[in-house]
């Protein structure tokens, strides 16, 4: 077990033209928050995928009010760490997810507005117990610094805080500076090299340079016994000069309860009332629940009474992600059909339909032929949403209104002649050809015979119609 | 004008099954989440639960076990159906439109009474 | 689930008299989603406010909400003759939605 430790030290507008002035927009004043979410592995992780080694949501900031002429290059910040308890193994391979969340104060539908301003997304290697890791990131136009650790609670030690470690009173078998391990006594903890000096059966570290005395023993290198030292009293890690471990008069003393959780004396016990995104014994367990409000823009959270369920963020129309943070582009899923054109109206989408289409999403085909006809025989033809009529052999034209010429397509292949007659055409083949067009050559073998022109028509006289 | 129409059995026997159908005109029922509401008569509103086209729903948990609600897009319609129905589930049902800026109620149908008795 | 408590159950007040009703919750009401329907007999809720203090469409700006957290409240500055009526809140941060038990205004 142990906590990740996030320190946001600034965020503002980044350096070239085009910064932004204000975080807020133009309805009035802002504040700002944070979210971090830890998700195990370097892997190119879904956005939508579960914080899965915890979030948690800082609180809100300062108001902030644009100072026309004179922007902040760093915006006021919530106070304080953001810390992700983590309940087993420290990974070592983790993706840091840190939203800048903007809410605006204006007058607003349905309460606050809530949008996401940034989001970075480092994929770090980083062991527990080690020192601070500095950054700085950009999104877009905006420029965010921050460090981060992570570091295990006791009794856990080690760069996975899987080893459970503890002092023991017993004299040590490990070298200058180690404290034996439990359950495997002979097993030692990886160095931090205590102040040179240190006792090795009363004394132990936890950061390199640093001497703390088992009870029953004091000064600088845990060599004197209590009982016969002016014991300052002190508890916890001592600082460089002296100090040391003495029984403490109740459970509460040096508060054991994590993350800013507040320690009350029970009889025999104490009781741990932990801030809002923690719980456990100690407030050593991150667990964001419908309680901390974690559904935007409208969403309603279901399910997350209490820590150990996860909540879902059910989203109004128009948005989504795991806490309804990200506006959809609903047109972008073509809910129109037929060639409709899609309006995105924030309430609602409207389909504008195609001339011949109807309904909410233009998936009626209206009836085109209906009230339409066809001159002269043209019979009517639905389909594309515009009506088409056939038109009988002679005639053209949207309507069938307009006289046609059958032969001005020259339908007779091979030099053959057409004649145009009020049945359709006729073509009169030229030699060595035959078929309805001509389309096919005469055997050597076989006897052509040219079609004689019907009666009434002349050669060459495609525009007489009888 | 958005409008919702309540429809069904006004008389239920006990131990039977409870259906209402909502139909819906004036708003795409594919746009909006769409929920139940009852109220025993004489008393206050209790939310049965919602759908939405997808087919997400969510439901009060104290009824959880015998309501389902369905979506018909194609009608534009949603319906109800409680099961195993005893004298205390006799009340007013009310279908109404989830708004988009929040899970509250902007559009209501005028609502239906339905008694459970034998 | 958050319990909302409405008070007080009846209200008698005459025309011209200002209303004040008050609706607490037993857990805070993130982000102020809350909304307050009026009821007449026979007929179905009417949506007054939502976000604890924004009017819906076509309601008189008689109507006001106000409050945060737990504590709510929906003011009625002038009461009018069609304005007595049963008033329900309602929250929306988390499910199950619940409304309060209402509270009846009455012609004194």
């Known amino acids: 077990a142990g906590v990740f430790e996030l320190q946001i030290h600034s965020f503002g507008p980044g350096p070239g033209p085009g910064a932004p002035r204000s975080p807020c927009s133009a309805r009035g004043p802002c504040r700002l928050f944070f979210r971090v979410c830890l998700k195990p592995g370097l892997s190119e992780e879904a956005a939508e995928s579960p914080c899965a080694l915890g979030a948690a949501l800082s609180a809100r900031g300062p108001v902030y009010t644009e100072q026309p002429e004179a922007p902040a290059p760093d915006l006021p910040l919530p106070n304080g760490l953001l810390q992700v308890p983590f309940r087993d193994a420290w990974p070592g391979t983790f993706s840091l997810i840190i939203e800048t969340w903007r809410e605006e104060l204006g007058d607003q539908i349905g309460g606050p507005a809530w949008s996401l301003l940034a989001r970075v997304t480092r994929r770090r290697r980083l062991a527990a117990g080690g020192p601070w890791a500095r950054d700085i990131q950009r999104a877009g136009a905006w420029e965010l610094r921050f460090s981060y650790r992570a570091r295990c609670e006791l009794p856990a030690v080690g760069t996975a805080c899987t080893r459970l470690c503890r002092p023991r009173s017993a004299p040590s078998r490990c070298g200058p500076g180690l404290r034996p391990c439990a359950p495997l006594e002979d097993e030692c903890e990886a160095p931090p090299v205590c102040r040179a000096g240190c006792s090795l059966e009363h004394g132990f570290c936890e950061q390199p340079g640093e001497c703390r005395c088992l009870e029953g023993w004091t000064g600088p290198l845990c060599m004197v016994p209590a009982s016969t030292s002016s014991c300052l009293g002190l508890r916890g890690p001592s600082s460089a000069t002296t100090g040391c471990l003495v029984p403490g008069p109740g459970p509460c003393d040096g508060n054991p309860c994590a993350n800013g959780g507040s320690c009350s004396e029970t009889p025999g016990s104490f009781e741990c009332t932990c801030p809002r995104g923690f719980y456990g014994l100690r407030c050593e367990v991150s667990g964001v629940t419908c309680a901390d409000g974690p559904c935007f823009n409208g969403g309603l959270c279901v399910g997350g009474a209490d820590p150990d369920s996860a909540y879902i963020c059910h989203c109004p129309p128009g948005f989504q992600g795991s806490n309804c943070e990200k506006r959809v582009d609903r047109c972008s899923l073509q809910p129109c059909r037929n060639g409709g054109l899609c309006l995105d109206l924030g309430h609602a989408l409207r389909c504008r339909c195609r001339a011949g289409f109807a309904g909410p999403r233009c998936e009626h085909n209206l009836d085109d032929c209906a009230g339409r006809a066809c001159a002269n025989g043209g019979t009517c033809v639905e389909g594309g949403g515009a009506h088409r009529c056939s038109c009988a052999l002679g005639f053209g034209g949207r309507d069938c209104r307009e006289r046609a010429d059958p032969c001005a397509a020259r339908p007779c292949a091979h030099g053959g002649r057409c004649y145009a007659h009020f049945s359709g055409l006729v073509c009169a083949c030229a030699p060595g050809y035959m078929g309805s067009r001509c389309e096919f050559p005469v055997h050597p073998d076989g006897v052509s015979a040219l079609p004689a022109a019907p009666p009434g028509l002349r050669p060459g006289d495609p525009q007489r119609y009888l | 004008q958005v409008q919702l129409q309540e429809s069904g059995p006004g008389l239920v026997k006990p131990s039977e099954t409870l259906s209402l159908t909502c139909t819906v005109s004036g708003a795409s029922i594919s746009s909006f989440y769409w929920s139940w509401i009852r109220q025993p008569p004489g008393k206050g509103l209790e939310w049965i639960g919602y759908?939405?086209?997808?087919?997400?729903?969510n439901y009060n948990p104290s009824l959880k076990s015998r309501v389902t609600i369905s979506v018909d897009t194609s009608k534009n319609q949603f319906s109800l159906k409680l099961s195993s129905v005893t004298a205390a589930d006799t009340a007013v049902y009310y279908c109404?439109?989830?708004?988009?800026?929040?899970?509250?109620?902007?559009?209501w149908g005028q609502g239906t009474l339905v008694t459970v008795s034998s | 689930e958050i319990v909302l408590t409405q008070s007080p159950g009846t209200l008698s007040l005459s025309p011209g008299e200002r209303a004040t009703l008050s609706c607490r919750a037993s857990?805070?009401?993130?982000?102020?989603?809350l909304a307050w329907y009026q009821q007449k007999p026979g007929q179905a809720p009417r949506l007054l406010i939502y976000g604890a203090s924004s009017r819906a469409t076509g309601i008189p700006d008689r109507f006001s909400g106000s409050g945060s957290g737990t504590d709510f409240t929906l003011t009625i500055s002038r009461l009018e003759p069609e304005d007595f009526a049963v008033y329900y809140c309602?929250?929306?941060?988390?499910?199950?939605?619940?409304f309060g038990g209402g509270t009846k205004v009455e012609i004194k």
């Open positions: 759908i939405y086209y997808s087919g997400t729903t």
């Open positions: 309602q929250q929306y941060d988390r499910s199950p939605l619940t």
């Open positions: 857990q805070s009401v993130n982000k102020n989603y």
């Open positions: 109404a439109r989830i708004a988009v800026a929040g899970f509250f109620f902007d559009y």
